[in-house]
Interface confidence: low
């Protein structure tokens, strides 16, 4: 696979050094350098400078540009789903439905059969079907903690709509948690958004699996819709494949 | 600017059509097709199919992939800083300073001076510096929508930390709106993250420019570094240029 | 990752990202950028072999399509993957200004 | 943006994306993929040229760049910009897999 | 041979700390999750915690949650147990355990160590 | 949490008899994999406790065949056929599907 052209480093430099004096005048829609006959003697103001730092320096909070893809992430990824455990499950007793939050338990022994391990998951995706909404509803999405407590995860302004619609959280960061630990029952938290001076903090949106009075020939499409984790991962035999060509170079 | 090479189109497409051929069986790890002879006959399950349409569907709020840039962020961004509006000001006086929120205000003329027309901004980030932090706190920013209601932008998950640190929220579309209308003062509420059934909704978080009792030597340090709009934005001469070349292609 | 911690530590001789350091001043013979003095805008070179045909079937081929050829191009070719901005200060007339270049500074390369 | 908009409706000569529908069957021979039956896979195709010497610093040239040489490459070529994956449907012995290939539809092309 | 060793069990007053460390070999310490569990004298068992083989996660019996921090290296083959703000009901003497999980096909723990006695009085 | 009642508390029992230990928990050890995650441990005096079942019936290794678990649900039985001297000590049931795990309170055996 080698070329037999030899490369005169040098000249490749020097090229792309002239390509960059055209850049630079190019990005800055320059013909030619701007003249410097009335620039100021002495250090730059201490204002220009600050505002060069702020521009410099990455800030938390500010999205970087996009990373290189990992080596892995070059191969194919099998594709499985796994559905919420119903809600007739014991799992659901102990949280109250209120008329802020839903709740979505899945089990990790299924995740586990789909992805034995976690560096082998690239990504999860929660999907729920919404239905019918009437009025704009902020959202916000929970994983299950400890014991009682939740931890916010990410939240979505759904607009109002005539017709069901399919959500999606990428959720891949807690679905690997959830492949390292030991429990049996993992879960999310679908609630309203409560701000602190807010009065009605009722969720209106209305998840397919959840709603109730429903007409016995429609439970299974129902069920099949009900909200479930669709999971991207690298099947265990590609992965030790990948391990062992990793130490090649 | 011309290559004098012709190019054999069908050459090309062959050539791709090969590479695509060791590609896919590449990225499937696979030495050469599998062998169909257990392929059971009929249709795919249901499953199967549902699972791959899962898969080919973009749904809601799912991140596609990047877009690619415009023509116009090529070029060059011109910078510029607008401070807030000192908390002394008349403006601040309407809005009590609760436990669960901190209010910056803004003036729209010193915006204008730096983008005169909303079309010219490309990015525009509030920036605050976050002092010392005991403890993690959630944080939600929202936008003065009209006379005493607000408008939820974004949130953020602040870690404990023993250092001061910058802050930065994309607040791009919200200062292209302020751009576009005729009012004078516009601004932002820090809030705690109140979640629906939560007990403690103060905003720990200390935010350089807020904190009172300062010794008066420090003012100014104080002040310099206090909320601003950090504004990236085409500069107008260029944006008149860039406009006429666009007829061009 | 054909990237700046993996290719300025090997002999990498196939598509890797380069050293180069921009000096203005030197390299440009330019004085009126005022900062930075300099900055790391390195550089894509190396080859991207065309590995398929069809009497190449086989597996040590294939395993080399992911550095070699990943976007299964009929001619592939050493380009930039991961970009850097870089911000600048110049004077226009009295004025100083604070710029940001887009995509100046190569972190890493790819066979595209 | 050099994409299928602008690409599949002119008759660019330069850098631009190319269109191309790959048929398992027919193209590739392959019964084994049984979803999709082929894909726009398409290609970049076309010149980027290298246009900066210190005898050509003028608008016309600079105005250039950013489609010719945007990273300022001492080759510059044309490349795949925007990539979009491909869900596959085929079996391993009697299982069906759904397995998403990325980076497969190139949607835009660029200097690079 | 699998063993585990435990050691660190020592007289402490109530509201004080201590870390108990355990040294594991015989086996490929990295690959198995690790669990402490404890008995006061005269009763039975109590689990205590666990860490999964990485180290990246932790689980806590609700009395220890907050006081309590599990913790392992596995280059050095040890697991930890930090115990801080003692009470007195925490005298027991601790085990160290090994846990087969579920996916390994058993949901049970084979191997304890000896014990190490901690006394929390004043 | 899920308690264990372990039943008798303690019993007494003639080399080469058999004894019978009974385990009851507050709700199904079923797991929803299917499984029931029930083990029986013993701890000799003076010693460590030791993984005699997993799984209500599957014997640890080294554990002789005179020791069988059954049950299914909640309830739960160990059965030791012909005792021998060195099977003193305490029986101890535990459940490791739901967390936080737990363990009964304990069964005394003696030999007379």
């Known amino acids: 696979l080698s070329t037999c052209k030899t490369i005169d480093m040098e000249l490749v430099k020097r090229k792309r050094i002239e390509a960059i004096r055209g850049q630079i005048l190019s990005k800055l829609r320059l013909a030619s350098p701007p003249s410097q006959g009335e620039v100021p003697p002495g250090p730059l103001p201490e204002a220009v400078l600050a505002l060069y730092n702020s521009t410099r320096d990455r800030v938390a909070g500010e999205s970087a540009e996009p990373e290189p893809e990992p080596e892995a992430d070059y191969y194919a990824k099998e594709v499985t789903r796994v559905l919420m455990v119903e809600t007739h499950n014991e799992i659901y007793d102990k949280f109250k439905q209120s008329t802020h939050s839903i709740y979505m338990f899945f089990n990790t022994s299924e995740l586990r059969e789909a992805v034995p391990e976690p560096v082998l998951l690239s990504r999860a995706e929660l999907r729920l079907l919404r239905l019918k909404l009437k009025v704009e509803q902020h959202v916000e999405l929970y994983q299950k903690y400890s014991n009682n407590s939740w931890r916010y995860l990410s939240n979505r302004l759904l607009a109002p709509s005539d017709s069901p619609e399919w959500l999606s959280f990428d959720v891949t960061g807690v679905v690997r948690q959830w492949l390292s630990r030991g429990g049996e029952i993992e879960g999310f938290r679908l609630s309203a958004h409560c701000s602190c001076d807010s009065r009605d903090n009722t969720l209106q949106v209305d998840i397919n699996g959840f709603t109730t009075g429903r007409r016995g020939d429609l439970a299974t499409i129902h069920g099949m819709n009900r909200p479930f984790l669709l999971l991207m991962a690298t099947p265990l035999e590609r992965a030790q494949h990948l391990q062992s060509s990793r130490h090649r170079r | 600017l011309s290559t004098c090479k012709t190019i054999d189109m069908e050459l090309v497409k062959r050539k791709r059509i090969e590479a695509i051929r060791g590609q896919i069986l590449s990225k499937l790890r696979l030495a050469s097709p599998p062998s169909q002879g257990e392929v059971p006959p009929g249709p795919l399950p249901e499953a199967v199919l549902a699972l791959y349409n899962s898969t080919r569907d973009r749904v809601a709020g799912e991140s596609a992939e990047p877009e690619p840039e415009p023509e116009a962020d090529y070029y060059a961004k011109e910078v510029t800083r607008v401070l807030m509006v000192e908390t002394h000001n008349e403006i601040y006086d309407k809005f009590k300073q609760s436990t669960h929120s901190i209010y910056m205000f803004f003036n729209t003329s010193e915006l204008r001076e730096a983008v005169p027309e909303p079309v010219l901004l490309s990015r525009a980030e509030l920036r605050l510096l976050r002092l010392k932090l005991k403890v993690e706190q959630h944080v939600e920013l929202y936008q003065k929508y009209s006379n005493n209601s607000w408008r939820y932008l974004s949130n953020r998950l602040l870690a404990p930390s023993d250092s001061p640190e910058w802050l930065s929220f994309d607040v791009t579309g919200v200062v292209r709106q302020w751009l576009s209308r005729g009012g004078e003062i516009e601004g932002f509420r820090l809030s705690a993250h109140c979640s629906c059934d939560s007990r403690d909704n103060t905003l720990q978080v200390d935010i350089n420019g807020f904190t009172t009792g300062r010794r008066g030597d420090l003012a100014t340090i104080h002040g310099m570094n206090r909320p601003f709009l950090l504004l990236m934005a085409t500069p107008l001469e260029r944006a008149q240029h860039l406009q006429s070349s666009r007829h061009r292609r | 990752a054909l990237d700046t911690n993996y290719c300025f530590s090997s002999t990498e001789k196939n598509c890797c990202v380069r050293q180069l350091y921009i000096d203005f001043r030197k390299d440009l013979g330019w004085k009126w950028i005022h900062e930075p003095k300099g900055y790391h805008a390195n550089f894509c070179l190396g080859p991207c072999p065309y590995i398929w045909s069809l009497d190449t079937q086989y597996s040590k081929v294939l395993a080399l399509y992911n550095q070699h050829n990943p976007g299964a191009s009929a001619a592939p070719c050493c380009v930039p993957q991961a970009l850097e901005p870089l911000p600048i200060v110049y004077y226009v007339g009295r004025k100083p200004k604070v710029e940001q270049l887009s995509n100046m500074i190569v972190r890493s390369c790819k066979c595209s | 943006a050099l994409d299928t908009n602008y690409c599949f409706s002119s008759t660019e000569k330069n850098c631009c994306v190319r269109q191309l529908y790959i048929d398992f069957r027919k193209d590739l021979g392959w019964k084994w993929i049984h979803e999709p039956k082929g894909y726009h896979a398409n290609f970049c195709l076309g010149p980027c040229p290298y246009i900066w010497s210190l005898d050509t610093q003028y608008s016309k040239v600079l105005a250039l760049y950013n489609q010719h040489n945007p990273g300022a490459s001492a080759a510059p070529c044309c490349v795949p910009q925007a990539l979009e994956p491909l869900p596959i449907v085929y079996y391993v012995g009697r299982k069906p897999k759904v397995e998403q290939l990325s980076n497969m539809i190139v949607r835009s092309c660029k200097c690079s | 041979e699998v063993q585990l060793v435990e050691s660190g069990g020592d007289l402490v007053q109530p509201g004080g700390s201590l870390r108990l460390s355990c040294a594991a070999s015989?086996?490929?310490?990295?690959?198995?999750?690790m669990d402490w569990v404890r008995q006061a004298p005269g009763k039975g068992l109590e689990w205590v915690s666990r860490?999964?083989?990485?180290?990246?996660?932790?689980f806590y019996t609700d009395s220890v949650e907050g006081r309590f921090t599990i913790s392992r290296d596995n280059a050095k083959n040890t697991l930890y147990l930090q115990m801080n703000s003692l009470k007195s009901e925490d005298t027991a003497v601790y085990y160290c355990?090994?846990?087969?999980?579920?996916?390994?096909?058993?949901?049970?723990?084979?191997?304890w160590g000896q014990g190490t006695q901690v006394t929390v009085s004043s | 949490a899920t308690m264990l009642t372990q039943s008798p508390g303690s019993l007494s029992v003639v080399p080469g008899e058999s004894a019978s230990i009974s385990c009851k928990a507050s709700?199904?050890?079923?797991?929803?994999?299917?499984?029931?995650?029930l083990s029986w441990l013993l701890q000799k005096p003076g010693q460590r406790p030791q993984l005699l079942i997993y799984q209500v019936s599957n014997r640890a290794s080294g554990v002789p065949d005179r020791f069988t678990g059954s049950g299914s649900g909640t309830d739960f039985t160990l059965k030791i056929s012909g005792v021998k001297a060195e099977d003193a000590g305490v029986y101890y049931c535990a459940q490791s599907t739901y967390y936080p795990y737990d363990f009964g309170s304990g069964t005394r055996l003696e030999i007379r």
């Open positions: 355990l090994r846990y087969i999980t579920r996916a390994q096909l058993m949901g049970a723990w084979d191997y």
């Open positions: 709700q199904s050890l079923v797991h929803t994999d299917g499984k029931t995650y």
């Open positions: 015989g086996f490929t310490f990295s690959s198995y999750w």
């Open positions: 860490i999964t083989n990485s180290g990246g996660t932790a």
